[in-house]
């Protein structure tokens, strides 16, 4: 058993049929010694008396808010949550496996640049009685500070018969060094509580591996005289790290016909312009990627040929 | 070339070679063998390799003030990785395919380190750690980890040379 926060405790249980459970001793936070009784949740049934209460925690029915009283007055509370371990593996019932980039990916994170700011998100089908708390650091043995905000519900989607809820959080490394080569990964830890079930999820990554630039901005076409060719030009996104001579991007320019089946013409360039042939009803798209490290491409920025 | 007197390196040449190194490091990574072994792990090999850190002067301001600190750090890293790529980790079982980009990568690391340091002048280099793989699966794991870490190192080096070529070239 360990303390999650004041008066909230997590009991770690090996979860299998007829498991013996864990013996837990609760102590009433009071100077009083006599006349103390214990109840669980809203029930008025007295579970025991005395300053301490010993219980065998085996299942969710044994978890909940234990309260000690004296003469009708509440002295203190202890909320017991359960953390299930099945066959040596902690349960992951609350969050959905996003399966990208690999199985058992519950948290996904992205950064728009090297400033040390990043966003993480996760999915669940649970709509009520759900709380999240997020902590983060750079490294784990001698952790350096990363500050995270509160997790918020950022999207709701219908997936078949189910509703899916997306939560996200923004974090910022306290003393980021954008030009350095990271040697210690960022650790993100999410505590999830649903009713009386506790679970924790972690992700470990380097900012360089979660970089995804915003799409190029100001995408423009300039027809070339007496030619089907056009000069496409664009600019670095505002959110990208500066100076651009140091934090350089590379670009992919694509000409795509109206039909998805039509052959796509692609050009790769380090410049912020390119000359392509503009077909009727086609569109021109440009996306960006870090020039020197193959993290994610940005989403496409597009303009119609006409 | 970065010479003892502190004159400038051939920024444009270094830029071109460091960008080639980036490409090679990424093309070598998937080709060192099939790999399901978790690339995480509670102990990181990357603790044993030289990193371009915050105080090494490789940021744009540091390069403007005095690029020598940064260039020395890059040189140290290039020599270190060049030794690793020539070690038993890459030459032992399982054998790399004859056309593996690791050979080219090895040669290019040496090429860039020579551009930075002419004969006769020696910056101190770091000892290569004893990672002591005794099994082929351990060598394979180390190859992946070393190449991942090399990709990060050469990316910073390439940024340094690109910025130098754009802003510090005579």
């Amino acid at each position: 058993i360990w303390e999650l926060k004041k008066d909230v405790y997590v009991v770690e249980l090996d979860w299998y049929p007829d498991a013996p459970g864990e013996m837990v001793v609760l102590t009433c936070d009071t100077p009083e010694e006599d006349g103390i009784t214990w109840t669980l949740d809203q029930s008025s049934e007295v579970l025991g008396s005395g300053k301490t209460l010993t219980i065998q925690v085996k299942e969710f029915g044994d978890a909940g808010q234990y309260t000690c009283h004296k003469g009708g007055e509440v002295l203190s509370h202890s909320l017991l949550l359960l953390h299930k371990k099945e066959d040596g593996i902690w349960s992951t019932d609350i969050l959905k496996d996003q399966k990208e980039p690999k199985n058992k990916t519950f948290l996904r994170c992205e950064a728009k640049n090297y400033s040390g700011r990043f966003t993480c998100w996760w999915l669940t089908t649970i709509s009520t009685d759900l709380t999240f708390s997020v902590k983060s650091s750079r490294g784990s043995s001698d952790p350096q500070g990363v500050t995270c905000g509160a997790a918020t519900l950022s999207a709701e989607r219908v997936r078949g018969d189910n509703k899916e809820y997306e939560y996200s959080v923004e974090c910022q490394e306290d003393s980021a060094c954008p030009a350095a080569e990271e040697s210690l990964p960022i650790e993100v830890m999410v505590d999830a509580v649903h009713k009386l079930k506790y679970e924790n999820y972690t992700s470990s990554f380097f900012i360089r591996d979660i970089i995804k630039p915003d799409p190029p901005k100001n995408l423009q076409l300039k027809p070339l005289k007496n030619s089907r060719q056009v000069e496409v030009s664009w600019e670095y996104p505002d959110t990208w790290s500066t100076p651009h001579s140091y934090f350089s991007l590379t670009f992919c320019v694509q000409v795509q016909g109206k039909s998805k089946r039509e052959k796509k013409d692609r050009v790769f360039t380090d410049k912020t312009s390119a000359t392509v042939i503009c077909r009727k009803n086609a569109s021109i798209s440009v996306r960006a990627q870090d020039r020197y490290y193959s993290s994610s491409w940005s989403e496409w920025a597009s303009v119609p040929c006409s | 070339r970065a010479v003892p007197g502190g004159s400038s390196p051939a920024w444009t040449q270094c830029q071109q070679l460091s960008q080639k190194l980036c490409t090679l490091a990424w093309s070598a990574h998937p080709l060192v063998g099939h790999m399901d072994l978790r690339e995480e792990g509670d102990e990181e090999t990357t603790n044993d390799v030289p990193h371009i850190q915050c105080g090494d002067g490789c940021d744009p301001q540091g390069l403007r003030d005095n690029s020598q600190f940064c260039l020395q750090r890059i040189h140290q890293g290039l020599i270190f990785y060049e030794k690793l790529l020539g070690s038993d980790i890459f030459t032992g079982e399982p054998s790399l395919l004859p056309d593996s980009p690791v050979g080219q990568l090895h040669a290019s690391l040496l090429g860039l380190s020579q551009l930075l340091q002419p004969e006769g002048h020696h910056w101190e280099t770091q000892q290569i750690p004893s990672l002591s793989p005794s099994q082929p699966w351990q060598r394979l794991l180390l190859r992946f980890k070393i190449l991942r870490s090399l990709q990060a190192f050469v990316a910073v080096a390439a940024r340094v040379f690109a910025h130098g070529a754009a802003t510090l070239s005579p």
């Epitope: - | 072994l37 102990e43 990181e44 399982p94 082929p136 351990q138 794991l141």
Partner: antibody
Framework: EVTLKESGPVLVKPTETLTLTCTVS????????ISWIRQPPGKALEWLGV???????NYNSGIKSRLTISKDNSKSQVVLTMTNMDPVDTATYYC???????????????WGQGTTVTVSS | DIVLTQSPDSLAVSLGERATINCRAS??????????MHWFQQKPGQPPKLLIY???NLESGIPDRFSGSGSRTDFTLTISSLQAEDVAVYYC?????????FGGGTKVEIK
């Protein structure tokens, strides 16, 4: 289908040399390592040695001086030679494929049926 | 050599009940976070069969009532609901250092 089959004498006299051949099919010896493992009657398993994809070998130091493992990739055969046999070497000898280096980390995914060798005069 | 000590030597479990076998290594069998510990099942007159590789990965074709956990020196094989066909001897094996070594085996029977 992956198969490994051991062949060789079932009876060997003390001080003689044992030669066992492992013939494999369904995969190439240039892609997978082969180990030899033995099991005395009613006892646990003992690893004898391995021949890697490139032809290099590692042996159990306890019997290294008596062992040689070689292979012929084109014939898909691996040969174990063990000199100076003794009655304590009586065991079932298995030829075993080591799983893909990058996934299995030294786990042995396919085993031959084994051949029982008795050392007796 | 790395010595692997299995416990218990034998185990009698009722059908449908849980069976747990432990394997302790005399030194860590982890290499940069990868546990080179594997589990095998051997039935009488048959060669061993790979069940679990790298401590916790289920070999293809093996029922998911078998699971493995642990790292460094302490490892566990669990059969969540014992079936009649699970009666066998179970061995752990390490491949972190030469020579590869096996545990002494745990015999699982039906109570």
């Amino acid at each position: 289908e992956v198969t490994l089959k051991e062949s060789g004498p079932v009876l060997v006299k003390p001080t003689e040399t044992l030669t066992l051949t492992c013939t494999v099919s369904g995969f190439s010896l240039t892609s997978y390592a082969i180990s030899w493992i033995r099991q005395p009657p009613g006892k646990a398993l003992e690893w004898l040695g391995v021949i890697w994809t490139g032809g290099g070998t590692n042996y159990n130091s306890g019997i290294k001086s008596r062992l040689t493992i070689s292979k012929d990739n084109s014939k898909s055969q691996v040969v174990l030679t063990m000199t100076n046999m003794d009655p304590v070497d009586t065991a079932t000898y298995y030829c075993v494929r080591e799983g893909d280096y990058g996934s299995y980390a030294g786990a042995m995914d396919y085993w031959g049926q084994g051949t029982t060798v008795t050392v007796s005069s | 050599d790395i010595v692997l000590t299995q416990s218990p030597d034998s185990l009698a479990v009722s059908l449908g009940e849980r069976a747990t076998i432990n394997c302790r290594a005399s030194e860590s069998v982890d290499y940069y976070g990868i546990s080179s510990m594997h589990w095998f099942q051997q039935k009488p007159g048959q060669p061993p069969k790979l069940l679990i590789y790298r401590a916790s990965n289920l070999e293809s074709g093996i029922p998911d009532r078998f699971s493995g956990s642990g790292s460094r020196t302490d490892f566990t094989l669990t059969i969540s609901s014992l079936q009649a066909e699970d009666v066998a001897v179970y061995y752990c094996q390490q491949a972190n250092k030469d020579p590869y070594t096996f545990g002494g085996g745990t015999k699982v029977e039906i109570k």
